[in-house]
C-alpha cells in the first residue's frame, strides 16, 4: 500500500476513502512533493498582505505587503507599517528620531549621529532626522575656531515593532 | 505525515507561569506558522496565537498581555508561556499548524490537560 | 473581533438521514479576493478537532464527499448528505479572515 502512495506525484494525494488512489489536491491546496497523504492549504494574503506568487497545486502562495507597508520576517511573515524618513516605529505609531538620531529609511530604528571625534575628525555637515552628520578633516588640519566634534547621542530607548 | 505533540506540567498552581511545549515530527517547522489553540472543559475552542518559523508573533488581544510563544529550529519545537494563569486558564492545550496566520488549522496535536488549582 | 454564531446548538439525527448546521457571522466573511474566509471543523469524542472545509466551500484532502459547505458573507452552512455514526461530535465553524480567529459555540451532532 505504501508504494501505491509513493506513485502519487506532485499536485496529488494519496486517497484513503478512494482505495488509496491518487487524487489531485482540491481547490487552493497543493502538494509540492510526491507521496503525500493530504495537500496542504494555501496561504492566503489577507489584510494588510497582498498576493505575490498565485497558489498552484504544486507550490504555495507567496505574499507581499500592501503599500504602506513593508515585509518582516523570512517569507514575508508579517508587514510592519511603514514611517517616513526621520522617524521610527513604536508601540504608539511612527514618532520623529530624537536629537542627535537619524532614520534614512521608511524602516527601521533612529540611530545615533556618527561621533566623528572618536576617528579623530571634525562635523563636516551638521546631522538631522533623516541623515547622519558628514565627517572632514580632523580638527588640526583644520584652523582654530573650526567646528568641534558633535556630542554623542543622548540616551534612548530602542524603537519597537508592534505585533 | 505531520504530527504535533504537545508537552508540560498537567497541574500550575494560581499566579504562576503555565509553560507548555509542541514537538513537530514529520516534517518541518518551517515555512508555516503555528498556534496554540485552548478548550476549557465542556466548553469551546479559543485561539492564543501563533508564531512563524521566523520568531513573527500575534497574539489574540484578550490575552496579549500574559502570553509569550517562542520556536526552536534547531529541535522543530515551539513553545507556550501564560502568566499569572488563575483558575480560568484550566483548559485541554491544543498545538496547530496554522496554514495563513490565524486560519485553517490542518493539523492539530491530541490536546495536553492543564488544571490551575492549589 | 468577529462574532460567530451557530445553529442549532444540539442536532439528533437517524443514521443515512441528511443534517445541516447554520453558522451565522457578524460581519462579511468575504474578501475581495472572492473567498469566504471560514473555516468547518469536527471534534469527534475524546479527540481534537480535524478540519472538514476551509474557505466556505472546500473539502479538506481526504474528507468524505458526504460533506459540503456552502454560504457566503455571513451566513453558511455546511451539510451533510448521510449521517454516519462516525460523524458524531461536535462541530465548529470558525473565521479566518481577522485575527484573532473565532469559533462558533459549537453544534453537537448525535444519532437518534
Known amino acids: 500500500l505504501q508504494d501505491l502512495c509513493s506513485n502519487c506525484p506532485a499536485g496529488t494525494f494519496c486517497d484513503n476513502n478512494r482505495s488509496q488512489i491518487c487524487s489531485p489536491c482540491p481547490p487552493n491546496s497543493f502538494s509540492s512533493a510526491g507521496g503525500q497523504r493530504t495537500c496542504d492549504i494555501c496561504r492566503q494574503c489577507k489584510g494588510v498582505f497582498k498576493t505575490r506568487k498565485e497558489c498552484s497545486s504544486t507550490s504555495n502562495a507567496e505574499c507581499d505587503c500592501i503599500s504602506g507597508y513593508h515585509c518582516l520576517g523570512a517569507e514575508c511573515s508579517m508587514c510592519e507599517q511603514d514611517c517616513k524618513q526621520g522617524q521610527e516605529l513604536t508601540k504608539k505609531g511612527c514618532k520623529d528620531c530624537c536629537f542627535g538620531t537619524f532614520n534614512d529609511q521608511k524602516r527601521g530604528i533612529c540611530r545615533p549621529w556618527t561621533n566623528c571625534s572618536l576617528d579623530g575628525k571634525s562635523v563636516l555637515v551638521n546631522g538631522t532626522k533623516e541623515r547622519d552628520v558628514v565627517c572632514g578633516p580632523s580638527p588640526a588640519d583644520l584652523s582654530p575656531g573650526a567646528s568641534s566634534a558633535t556630542p554623542p547621542a543622548p540616551a534612548r530607548e530602542p524603537g519597537h515593532s508592534p505585533q | 505525515q505531520v504530527q504535533l505533540q504537545e508537552s508540560g506540567p498537567g497541574l500550575v498552581k494560581p499566579s504562576e507561569t503555565l509553560s507548555l511545549t509542541c514537538t513537530v515530527s514529520?516534517?518541518?517547522?518551517?515555512?508555516?506558522?503555528w498556534s496554540w489553540i485552548r478548550q476549557p472543559p465542556g466548553k469551546g475552542l479559543e485561539w492564543i496565537g501563533y508564531?512563524?518559523?521566523?520568531?513573527?508573533?500575534n497574539y489574540n488581544p484578550s490575552l496579549k498581555s500574559r502570553v509569550t510563544i517562542s520556536v526552536d529550529t534547531s529541535k522543530n519545537q515551539f513553545s507556550l508561556k501564560l502568566s499569572s494563569v488563575t483558575a480560568a486558564d484550566t483548559a485541554v492545550y491544543y498545538c496547530?499548524?496554522?496554514?495563513?496566520?490565524?486560519?485553517?488549522?490542518?493539523?492539530w496535536g491530541q490536546g495536553t490537560l492543564v488544571t490551575v488549582s492549589s | 473581533e468577529i462574532v460567530m454564531t451557530q445553529s442549532p446548538l444540539s442536532l439528533p439525527v437517524t443514521p443515512g438521514e441528511p443534517a445541516s448546521i447554520s453558522c451565522r457571522s457578524s460581519?462579511?466573511?468575504?474578501?475581495?479576493?472572492?473567498?469566504?474566509?471560514l473555516d468547518w471543523y469536527l471534534q469527534k469524542p475524546g479527540q481534537s478537532p480535524q478540519l472538514l472545509i476551509y474557505?466556505?466551500?472546500n473539502r479538506a484532502s481526504g474528507v468524505p464527499d458526504r460533506f459540503s459547505g456552502s454560504g457566503s458573507g455571513t451566513d453558511f452552512t455546511l451539510k451533510i448528505s448521510r449521517v454516519e455514526a462516525e460523524d458524531v461530535g461536535v462541530y465548529y465553524c470558525?473565521?479566518?479572515?481577522?485575527?484573532?480567529?473565532?469559533f462558533g459555540q459549537g453544534t453537537k451532532l448525535e444519532i437518534k
Open positions: 496547530a499548524r496554522d496554514q495563513s496566520g490565524g486560519g485553517s488549522f490542518q493539523h
Open positions: 514529520g516534517g518541518s517547522i518551517s515555512s508555516y506558522y
Open positions: 508564531i512563524y518559523y521566523s520568531g513573527s508573533t
Open positions: 460581519q462579511s466573511l468575504l474578501y475581495s479576493n472572492g473567498y469566504n474566509h
Open positions: 474557505l466556505g466551500s
Open positions: 470558525m473565521q479566518a479572515l481577522q485575527t484573532p480567529p473565532t
